[in-house]
Amino acid sequence: EEELQVIQPDKSVLVAAGETATLRCTATSLIPVGPIQWFRGAGPGRELIYNQKEGHFPRVTTVSELTKRENMDFSIRIGNITPADAGTYYCVKFRKGSPDDVEFKSGAGTELSVRAKPSAPVVSGPAARATPQHTVSFTCESHGFSPRDITLKWFKNGNELSDFQTNVDPVGESVSYSIHSTAKVVLTREDVHSQVICEVAHVTLQGDPLRGTANLSETIRVPPTLEVTQQPVRAENQVNVTCQVRKFYPQRLQLTWLENGNVSRTETASTVTENKDGTYNWMSWLLVNVSAHRDDVKLTCQVEHDGQPAVSKSHDLKVSAHPKEQGSNTAAENTGSNERNIY
């Protein structure tokens, strides 16, 4: 009788993560009598995957009934495959020995490759906000995919970006891989509503790439422009001075009125109006009782936006142009938001 051969007909098997791998093995003879064992890897460090004789292997099932005496099919199924299961599996026939069974013949091995989907890309931007015309960096990370081949693209509002660098790790063989990419984006004043998108394409995704997004609203700071103007009011001793705070983002803003350098009133932007581009406008006004002033008044609108150094705009109020009201020596002012007069 010809000597027993162990046949593993599949050189390689490709399985998607989460699925079941079938590793085929048959023997050409029942003799010599002895068990079959499955190992991952070869040599002294090989890992036991299944032992026909003893042990508990909850993820492994046999294709045929191995306790049947005439059985020569030693194929196994391994359930719930993960990238960590990748490797070369050997079906090994042992002959009975004492004190231990003795390895008799090994199959040629079956390489199990695991296709694993990349994790959802996570896009993160800079820790601090930046202003238009500045270049900021965004990173995109995705993990746990196999095989190594992967494509990553960056978009800003649907337009593909070209200024980015991508690394796939590790460089050598591994059960699974990670991708890390950094893109540079130049901010513009119109970017409050903009989105940066990282798109990852992989063989496991069947043409339906994964996307991660970052809103530039979390990255950009658009500093306000200030304009101070003066309008006359019906009462001839009063002047309405308006500070227009335009095109700022984010909303966090504090405004202080100064009369000749002295703080007159401080208020926080509340009832703002939003522009189409996502920036905000706000207006504050000051009702000045001109008769309370002997000399010209320098009115300053000072704005502190999003914790940044204050910016200001001044307006010189010419007192000489207004007749003074006798006996009055205090300036009247009101809050810009509800036009209440305070005397």
Partner: antibody
Framework: QVQLVQSGAEVKKPGASVKVSCKAS????????IVWVRQAPGQGLEWMGW????????NYAQKLQGRVTMTTDTSTSTAYMELRSLRSDDTAVYYC?????????????WGRGTLVTVSS | DIQMTQSPSSVSASVGDRVTITCRAS??????LAWYQQKPGKAPKLLIY???NLQSGVPSRFSGSGSGTDFTLTISSLQPEDFATYYC?????????FGGGTKVEIK
């Protein structure tokens, strides 16, 4: 046909040795192990030991260690069991059997048995 | 060593009866248990291997079950030729051990 043919009955004196043969035919002798089992009159079955016909490795019952030797001759497909320093309680029918399990031990083919009587 | 305890040691039954013999191992032996039938003056004959597999040529009225430590041999409908002594045997590891036997006698 597939069979195990054992040597004939033996009468031995205490302290003597006995060598029982078991000739296999009809199958590949080296593909299977051979076990020896004995049965004293009116008693149950007692496993004596095992030998690999492929490589000659052995495993003996503790109580017989040092008194028993199992060998094979692959050229004649024959297994032998020698028991030394015989005592009266060694009187039994000695069976050889083919050990056929793949990852376990069971015996699917038996010889007819050899009666060994130890008597002074 | 693994001890094998068989019960009952004897049973009286009639042709057509259902007969059940049990065997308990002193420690877990997976499914590595065999059952033998022995008639007076004859060698044992393998009936069941690996706890539940019927040996080739053995009538289907014989069946085996169990795993771990507790095993059963069942003869579904006793026939005249079934009156004999039955032995269980653990085949998990050396030393191989047999149960004490169960004698099935005619009632």
């Amino acid at each position: 046909q597939v069979q195990l043919v054992q040597s004939g009955a033996e009468v031995k004196k205490p302290g003597a040795s006995v060598k029982v043969s078991c000739k296999a035919s009809g199958y590949t002798f080296t593909g299977y192990g051979i076990v020896w089992v004995r049965q004293a009159p009116g008693q149950g079955l007692e496993w004596m030991g095992w030998i690999s016909a492929y490589a000659g490795e052995t495993n003996y019952a503790q109580k017989l260690q040092g008194r028993v030797t199992m060998t094979t001759d692959t050229s004649t497909s024959t297994a032998y069991m020698e028991l030394r320093s015989l005592r009266s309680d060694d009187t039994a029918v000695y069976y050889c059997a083919r050990e056929a399990g793949s990852s376990w031990y069971d015996f699917d083919l038996w010889g007819r048995g050899t009666l060994v009587t130890v008597s002074s | 060593d693994i001890q094998m305890t068989q019960s009952p040691s004897s049973v009286s039954a009639s042709v057509g009866d259902r007969v059940t013999i049990t065997c308990r191992a002193s420690q877990g032996i997976s499914s590595w248990l065999a059952w033998y039938q022995q008639k007076p003056g004859k060698a044992p004959k393998l009936l069941i291997y690996a706890a539940s597999n019927l040996q080739s040529g053995v009538p289907s009225r014989f069946s085996g079950s169990g795993s771990g430590t507790d095993f059963t041999l069942t003869i579904s409908s006793l026939q005249p030729e079934d009156f004999a002594t039955y032995y269980c045997q653990q085949g998990a590891s050396f030393p191989i051990t047999f149960g004490g036997g169960t004698k099935v006698e005619i009632k």
